[in-house]
Interface confidence: low
């Protein structure tokens, strides 16, 4: 099964992608696809993907447990991605493990999906 | 197994509008994007931007104006491409392709000619 | 937009030789890299994915490598089959972009 391109596909800030549709021209803020849970390794590397679409194109934040997810320098990150943003965790330790939410809003409407790496 | 088989080719005077369609076959057309890429007479690949079956979002490149939209009838798992106030330089093939461009439609030539 | 700019634009081969075709971008793209072969009057077909990641049913001659800025399509041992246009697409960044493509032709 190949991977979709969402994994790895680093984006610059969603704030950048220029939409041009009359499909567009309202504001909406929309989950595409709701988050996977993950089940890995120890000393693997974890991704969880937030897929979500808005207009003005959406601020998405992560959360561990309900706290901010802090990035770790070339262990711990999150960007966007063409279909929205990317949380990757490298060399997995047992610590890494719960509940993960995506928070996007577009300044008006807030959208979130939660999911569980164990 | 997946396919994507788009209409036939289109001759159209400048001005007209023009809409091709992309029928998906042998996947959920709902949980993948579809992507447009154009293609003028010899030249390369220019990718348009997507839809997003689920919901009809789109995501266009901005090179291409509002003349040019996305749809969708998911009741026969089909994409669309509308263009209007056709113009000379809109003569290509279009294709259509599944979220990681992994499956092609056959493309649409559209021709715009006086 | 991030610009994609293959070398060599075209080249001349024999069955049998190793080609390779370089695609540079503009700005580090990561490993998010498709390269394609397309044949006249049909739809490209996807060769490697993720810069360096076979897709499902292409031959094994075909291989990828490269990150960041510089990526590379080999053809270990050209078949007849494999005269056609080459193109590579960087997924990193909005709008997507392909190259311009590099026509390999038959010497």
């Known amino acids: 099964q190949e991977t979709e391109l969402s994994v790895s596909a680093e984006l610059v800030p969603t704030s950048s992608w220029n939409i041009s549709s009359e499909l567009n021209k309202d504001s909406y803020l929309t989950l595409d696809e709701p988050m996977n849970n993950i089940t890995t390794s120890l000393g693997q590397t974890a991704e969880l993907h937030c897929k979500v679409s808005g207009n003005p194109p959406p601020t998405i934040r992560w959360f561990k447990n309900d706290a901010p997810v802090v990035q770790e320098p070339r262990r711990l990150s999150f960007r966007s991605t063409i279909y929205g943003s990317r949380l990757r965790i490298r060399n997995l330790d047992t610590t890494d493990t719960g509940y993960f939410q995506c928070v996007a809003t577009n300044g008006k409407e807030v959208v979130s999906s939660t999911g569980v790496l164990f | 197994q997946v396919q994507l088989v788009q209409s036939g080719s289109e001759l159209k005077k400048p001005g007209a509008s023009v809409k091709v369609s992309c029928k998906a076959s042998?996947?959920?057309?709902?949980?993948?994007?579809m992507h447009w890429v154009r293609q003028a007479p010899g030249q390369g690949l220019e990718w348009m931007g997507w839809?997003?079956?689920?919901?009809?979002?789109?995501k266009f490149n901005h090179k291409f104006d509002g003349r040019f939209v996305f749809s969708l009838d998911t009741s026969v798992s089909t994409a669309y491409l509308q263009i209007s106030s056709l113009k000379a330089e809109d003569t290509a093939v279009y294709y259509c392709a599944r979220s990681d461009f992994d499956y092609w439609g056959q493309g649409t030539l559209v021709t715009v000619s006086s | 937009d991030i610009q994609m700019t293959q070398s060599p634009s075209s080249l001349s081969a024999s069955v049998g030789d190793r080609v390779t075709i370089t695609c540079q971008a503009s700005q580090d793209i990561g490993n998010n890299l498709i390269w394609y072969q397309q044949k006249p009057g049909k739809a490209p077909k996807r060769l490697i994915y993720?810069?360096?990641s076979l897709a499902n049913g292409v031959p094994s001659r075909f291989s990828g490598s490269g990150s960041g800025t510089e990526f590379t399509l080999t053809i270990s041992s050209l078949q007849p089959e494999d005269f056609a246009t080459y193109y590579c697409l960087q997924y990193r960044e909005y709008p997507l972009t392909f190259g311009q493509g590099t026509k390999l032709e038959i010497k």
């Open positions: 042998g996947y959920t057309l709902t949980t993948n994007y």
């Open positions: 839809i997003y079956p689920g919901n009809g979002n789109t």
């Open positions: 993720f810069a360096t």
